[in-house]
Amino acid sequence: EICGPGIDIRNDYQQLKRLENCTVIEGYLHILLISKAEDYRSYRFPKLTVITEYLLLFRVAGLESLGDLFPNLTVIRGWKLFYNYALVIFEMTNLKDIGLYNLRNITRGAIRIEKNADLCYLSTVDWSLILDAVSNNYIVGNKPPKECGDLCPGTMEEKPMCEKTTINNEYNYRCWTTNRCQKMCPSTCGKRACTENNECCHPECLGSCSAPDNDTACVACRHYYYAGVCVPACPPNTYRFEGWRCVDRDFCANILSAESSDSEGFVIHDGECMQECPSGFIRNGSQSMYCIPCEGPCPKVCEEEKKTKTIDSVTSAQMLQGCTIFKGNLLINIRRGNNIASELENFMGLIEVVTGYVKIRHSHALVSLSFLKNLRLILGEEQLEGNYSFYVLDNQNLQQLWDWDHRNLTIKAGKMYFAFNPKLCVSEIYRMEEVTGTKGRQSKGDINTRNNGERASCESDVLHFTSTTTSKNRIIITWHRYRPPDYRDLISFTVYYKEAPFKNVTEYDGQDACGSNSWNMVDVDLPPNKDVEPGILLHGLKPWTQYAVYVKAVTLTMVENDHIRGAKSEILYIRTNASVPSIPLDVLSASNSSSQLIVKWNPPSLPNGNLSYYIVRWQRQPQDGYLYRHNYCSKDKIPIRKYADGTIDIEEVTENPKTEVCGGEKGPCCACPKTEAEKQAEKEEAEYRKVFENFLHNSIFVPRPE
């Protein structure tokens, strides 16, 4: 039975009975705000295998695992997401494990598991087997792994039942609970699903199947479901619906949905039954179910009740799909996201006119504004304080506004403001002034020439290296003295360097969504002697390590509106000399007889050259009393023991607090104060958490029904 169009279970746990016969939830599933701790053991929904949108759990008291509720939930399709997430587990006070041991696929979207104080078995799940990309997963504020003592089935009895995979360089067993392994299909199946007996499913199956190579035995479909069969495409006279099944024209004509109370009803276009015609198409007559191409962009006016529309996620951008004229103001604040540019283009790419202002701030995920690919007019009917109608502030990775060779954008009224966009060249801003017709409107402080483009490559001349010398931890380089037209414009040089195992770095590498930079920077003053070539000694480097180095000339950015030419070198790759290797890692010894030891180890993390041999030394030692201090039969009391890796175990530090001043030589230091960048990153992280929490609260707290 298909249940829909989204099920919201709140306040009373007995509402769960609504899920009794559901095999597929066509829509979302919310289970939330059940404040009285209940016994959920009598509730079990083995029929539920697929949720087409997302699963949200929030403040459900007494629920300790989802495994008993949904033992066969196999696929969450993520056709629509909750703030970019397909699985959200938030503030579940009693949840001890997720336990969705049959969950095999989250087709779209990431997961957010946050503020679940008792939740364990998070590090034992390999999400990369379930999701395409794990980089946007947000798993924070749950029970610390050290307090969990997660053990996969059979580990205690030394008969491990689960398979191992590598996550963050840790090769470990993968499981959902103390008695449920994470299922992995044989490598022979490739990307196909498999049965419980490890037989490969039909290619059209997703997640699992009850019989091998049979498109009628799938638990869920990779593409579409029709009349009991998984099909790669919907058969003639049927249409794709909600991203997972095929329906007929009559079904589509009769849909009356709370989500699309639009009086015109659903349409059939390009083989799909959808809420409205897609971008570039319009209904063939007001009551038609069919779409025809628009001549030019289709007009669609969208209005924001609150005047200003904040775009802070894919979900919020989704509301603007198909809009060509936006009546109001746009505030773009995209801090992170997966495939964000194409998602934004998909939902905002048709906007041609914004009647108010456009403000882009703290959008560290944006490199370009080209996702607004049809924006041609900002009317500036409403302006920000200071009469700004285009305002760009603190976007750490923004490098390009638009491709001005192929873009006509007019700002009818209001000024522009640019500040703290470190990768946005001032020349790009000046170009925008010319194209948009705002040149002369801005006052001196509106385009900050010091903090825009400060970390960008805005140069036009090439600097050439003249010599390089290396030792085990030093590199000396020199380069041609650069002579701009006016020698007074040259202030100094900046040398950028970083480790580069491969010769594939760009100067924009290592800048994450929060704007951090992986390059080290050193300033080099101009030698007073005009005949001496500038150079630098880079020290404190690692032996036998390839570094990437480039140099930039720091020039005066502007002299009476003349644009000064800058200069920059190509990236040079250079390797330091070899040195003594670091200690071998993960030394393990085991006795296989009364007179023999077998010793194993891993290579050193820093070989500092090509290793040729190892030296093994040994000596007799007294028995370690530590071995008798713990009950090894209790999973909760297993001490977390790491083999020495050169770092200080946090537990050891807390046992022996050290009070030396930072930099003291007597012992381990206390933690150094956080850098400004770290503080900023923490602040932004906290802000991002708040934004999500607000979104969550705004979405789920609704007036009580009549």
Partner: antibody, heavy 117, light 112 residues
């Protein structure tokens, strides 16, 4: 997929209130569609009584408006019919049905209510 | 209320022969949006009604093509090109264009 099931007393005394409940499974009554009551006196034709919209608003047949109330319990995914001051003329098979943008697509199997003292 | 009048009220037919049912409204049932929400339902003995035709002439997916609907404004017709034994039952027209919906009184189709 969507199922509707009528329930309620099969016998009601004249002048009392007839109460029926329709339990919906497979679709949330707040998610869309119009949730209707239709009746059919024995050996006669179908008569539309009214509906409750997914947003909770109502529409009733004018001649029954003073006696009829259609309400819902969203937590149980049910909607109900109350018909007051019944007479023998209200004896009928009562159907609940879902109506979309264009037509009735799902019907309950019907429940006979007899008005008799 | 819009009154929907069906005729005939009873229609004895021979299998394989055509049949036609008329439905008239006393005023136009064209909705303000241009659509005419006129449906035909069949109620077989002991069953709930089932849809055959919607919006005057659109045959529901799975309904045999011997059924067809036509008409406009106030006059509508359901035709069965060749009646089969399984087609017996009561046929109702229904209008959903006006705010208060109404059924016709029904036409009973039976085999001679």
């Amino acid at each position: 997929q969507v199922q509707l099931q009528e329930s309620g007393p099969g016998l009601v005394k004249p002048s009392e209130t007839l109460s029926l409940t329709c339990t919906v499974s497979g679709y949330s009554i707040t998610g869309g569609y119009l949730w209707n009551w239709i009746r059919q006196p024995p050996g006669k034709g179908l008569e539309w009584i009214g509906y409750i919209h997914y947003d909770g608003t109502n529409n009733y047949k004018p001649s029954l408006k003073d006696r009829v109330t259609i309400s819902r319990d969203t937590s149980k995914n049910q909607f109900s019919l109350k018909l007051s001051s019944v007479t023998a003329a209200d004896t009928a098979v009562y159907y609940c049905a879902r109506h979309g943008r264009v037509f009735f697509d799902y019907w309950g199997q019907g429940t006979l209510v007899t008005v008799s003292s | 209320d819009i009154v929907m009048t069906q005729s005939p009220l009873s229609l004895p037919v021979t299998p394989g022969e055509p049949a036609s049912i008329s439905c008239r409204s006393h005023q136009s049932i064209v909705h303000s949006n241009g659509n005419t929400y006129l449906q035909w339902y069949l109620q077989k003995p002991g069953q709930s009604p089932q849809l055959l035709i919607y919006k005057v002439s659109n045959r529901l997916y799975g309904v045999p093509d011997r059924f067809s609907g036509s008409g406009s404004g106030t006059d509508f017709t359901l035709k069965i090109s060749r009646v089969e034994a399984e087609d017996v039952g009561v046929y109702y027209c229904f209008q959903g264009s006006h705010v208060h919906w109404t059924f016709g009184q029904g036409t009973k189709v039976e085999i001679k």
